[in-house]
């Protein structure tokens, strides 16, 4: 209370003291900061706390995204784009909210995280909680059997997220898929691929991808004795095998999940294996897998994907896991998933995985779950785990503090004397209607050193100052910020000069 | 808690330059007016100079105005104080400062300051 | 500039004495005014902001009074731990000036 009493009576000297100051018709840029001092006081004092108790903040699982990060990101996001357009996709969109029926249904124990919206005048709504399912909906609602497109949107998911960790409820997802009858695993070598180049491309660290096949896992059940009905919950034990170890999975599958201590025991012998090839190989000499027929498909095409890996180049980044086996209900073939990797502490150890940054699978039924007649059209496709990259990305720039420039203005336009407003307007539209970025300050008469300080804050390369004697000459003082070496330069030239400069192509194509 | 950490000074000729640093911890750097102030060993304190929020204001004490710049990094949490032209008057323990209620100019926290020496 | 004048510039008093500081500004400051203690190789630290308002964790025994030109920290019984320099600053125009201090002795 006493805090809040200061508060007020602070407003209220500083209330006086702008007064006083307009009366005595003090200097405007004193006014000026006096009274934002005022204002900032006033907000400090927020509502009166009798009357509001609220905290602004953003909701639980969500954040802001200051100029800092929106450069991260857009850097993110080109390599991703970059990567998706060279490999051919094209772009979509769809709502951020589906039908509630529509999402019903295809993501097993992980519909609890679905958010529903309330009642909008009688439709049921969800917010999207991936971008597959929308994809899905839309090509069985277009009739489409073909095509290769990539999403980039935010989805949301109920979850206690550990923020810290680049996990929220709203997150971006960077999804590729490709949809169509092809010859088999020609399109998911290709997404492997995509997913390779595009964690390659971002820098961040060792990465391994892990891959898996549905049927290799449901027969692999099947033949350890694991009933129909339990193979989803029992899936999504084993996917916990890269967080937990064995026992503790044992211990859920058995005690929580009702499993046989002996088919838990048969299990484990198939599901702490990982390897390559080798391990295909070795899988499609095993007796009693290699006698059930999804397994066998399974394993036929891992081993046509490692042949395509190893043309693509990327063998060597893909490890062959059999705990592998990714929460999503609606995957029926091969499924993938990219960790980064930490240093081991001594040589010799395995590498360890800090967290998924990328995933995917083929989900071939998913489409005809939306047809009348069940028409499926087969699919496969990745997802980037943008969010992660971000955190990854961010932290490295801060370790290595390292300056990121948050606009891309090329040049300022500035002048070195007084009453030259007019003429700098002329010339920033001018360098505008050239497409070049420009800025200028917004103050009729600024000090030129002021102007200059802007630059290095805001890591503008280039000064365009405009002086009376220039202007007489038909010249421009085109000075390099960093350099701050100055040379006149025509007027006539100065956009070709500038272009030239910050190697901008000197035609808008 | 609030921490503001000087760094930077030392022993310079008349006519040198230095650069002060101020680390902050603690509390929101980007919404405080910060300062500097100094005081000569065995004199009083005189406030130097402080610069807003936001970096749009800046004043300067008669006695350093065109030698020091004060400047701030809202992203690294930290204050400077760039000295050229050094005198030696200009000897004191200099301390990083932090305003009252963001804006007031008291100086509510206070480093443990930074000596800085100009003598031949 | 506002020039700030202390008294006395120095005063010897025993522990548990009610001691009075006075400033006075060269011209009106209203209440933005603020006193200071500094002890020896120490920062100095905030006793009172804006003539009366005490400063959190400050013990009640200091308070500050005035408005305009002159203003008065009292210290109403000493403690062993206030014997320090003290010094009030004005807060309404830049440059901002202290007054030359009042160092507070054992006697």
């Known amino acids: 209370m006493a805090e809040r009493a200061a508060l007020e009576e602070l407003v209220k000297l500083q209330g006086e003291r702008v007064r006083g100051l307009k009366q005595q018709k003090a200097s405007a840029e004193l006014i000026e900061e006096e009274v934002a001092k005022l204002l900032k006081l006033k907000a400090q004092l927020g509502p009166d706390e009798s009357k509001q108790k609220f905290v602004l903040k953003t909701p639980k699982g969500t954040r802001d995204y200051s100029p800092r990060q929106m450069a991260v990101r857009e850097k993110v996001f080109d390599v991703i784009i970059r990567c998706f357009k060279r490999h051919g996709a094209e772009v979509i969109d769809t709502p951020v909210f589906e039908l509630k029926e529509t999402l019903m249904g295809k993501y097993g124990e992980d519909s609890k995280l679905i958010y529903d919206l309330k009642d909008q005048g009688g439709e049921l709504l969800s917010l999207r909680y991936d971008l597959t399912v929308p994809f899905a909906r839309y090509l069985a609602m277009n009739k489409l059997t073909n095509i290769k497109r990539y999403h980039i949107a935010k989805v949301y998911r109920r979850d206690n997220p550990a923020m810290t960790r680049g996990r929220y409820r709203e997150f971006y997802q960077c999804d590729f898929d490709i949809a169509g009858n092809f010859d088999p695993m020609i399109p998911d070598a290709e997404c492997l691929k995509i997913m390779c180049e595009i964690l390659s491309s971002l820098q961040i660290g060792d990465f391994l991808v892990k891959v898996n096949d549905r049927r290799i896992l449901d027969g692999m059940f099947a033949i350890c004795g694991v009933s129909d009905s339990k193979f989803r919950t029992i899936c999504s034990s084993v996917d916990k095998l890269d967080k937990v170890s064995w026992e503790e999975v044992k211990n859920e599958m058995v005690g929580e999940k009702g499993l046989a201590p002996e088919v838990a025991d048969r299990i484990g012998d198939y599901v702490q294996q990982h390897g390559g090839v080798s391990l295909v190989e070795q899988l499609l000499q095993d007796p009693k897998l290699s006698q059930n027929k999804q397994a066998l498909e399974g394993l036929g095409d891992l081993k046509l994907l490692f042949e395509y890996l190893t043309l693509f180049g990327i063998d060597d980044k893909i490890s062959f896991d059999l705990s592998l086996a990714r929460g999503l209900d609606y995957y029926t073939g091969v499924i993938y998933e990219a960790v980064l990797l930490q240093t081991p502490a001594q040589a010799g150890e395995e590498p360890l995985g800090v967290g998924s940054v990328a995933a995917g699978g083929r989900y071939d039924g998913l489409v005809g779950m939306f047809d009348p007649k069940g028409r499926k059209v087969p699919c496969v496709g990745l997802s980037i785990g943008v969010e992660r990259i971000f955190s990854i990305v961010e932290q490295r720039l801060e370790a290595l503090e390292e300056k990121i420039r948050t606009t891309e203005t090329q040049v300022l336009v500035a002048s070195a004397q007084k009453k030259l407003l007019e003429e700098r307007l002329k010339l920033v539209s001018e360098l505008w209607d050239a497409g070049i970025k420009a800025e200028l300050l917004y103050k009729k008469n600024p000090k030129l050193l002021n102007q200059l300080q802007y630059c290095e804050e805001a890591g503008i390369p280039l000064v365009a100052i405009i002086g009376e004697q220039e202007l007489k000459d038909g010249v421009i003082k085109l000075r390099s910020v960093t350099s701050r070496e100055e040379v006149d330069v025509r007027r006539e030239d100065l956009v070709e000069e500038i272009k030239r400069r910050t190697g901008q192509p000197l035609c808008i194509c | 808690q609030v921490q503001l950490v000087e760094s930077g000074g030392g022993l310079v000729k008349p006519g040198g330059s230095l650069r002060l640093s101020c680390a902050a911890s603690?509390?929101?750097?980007?919404?405080?007016?910060m300062s500097w102030i100094r005081q000569a060993p065995g004199k009083g304190l005189e406030w130097v100079s402080y610069?807003?929020?936001?970096?749009?204001?800046?004043k300067y004490t008669d006695s350093v105005r065109g030698r020091f710049t004060i400047s701030r990094d809202n992203a690294k949490n930290s204050l400077y104080l760039q000295m050229n032209s050094l005198r030696a008057e200009d000897t004191a323990v200099y301390y990083c400062?932090?305003?009252?209620?963001?804006?007031?100019?008291?100086?509510?926290?206070w480093g443990q300051g930074t000596l800085v020496t100009v003598s031949s | 500039d506002i020039q700030m004048t202390q008294s006395p510039s120095s005063v010897s008093a025993s522990v548990g004495d009610r001691v009075t500081i006075t400033c006075r500004a060269s011209?009106?400051?209203?209440?933005?005014l603020a006193w200071f203690q500094q002890k020896p190789g120490k920062a100095p630290k905030l006793l009172i902001y804006?003539?009366?308002n005490l400063e959190s964790g400050v013990p009640s025994r200091f308070s500050g009074s005035g408005s305009g030109t002159d203003f008065t920290l009292t210290i109403s019984s000493l403690q062993p731990e206030d014997f320090a320099t003290y010094y009030c600053?004005?807060?309404?125009?830049?440059?901002?000036?202290f007054g030359q201090g009042t160092k507070l002795e054992i006697k």
């Open positions: 603690g509390f929101t750097f980007s919404d405080y007016y």
């Open positions: 610069i807003s929020d936001s970096s749009r204001y800046t």
């Open positions: 600053q004005q807060a309404n125009s830049f440059p901002y000036t």
């Open positions: 011209q009106g400051i209203s209440s933005w």
């Open positions: 400062a932090r305003y009252l209620y963001q804006v007031i100019a008291i100086a509510k926290s």
């Open positions: 804006v003539a009366s």
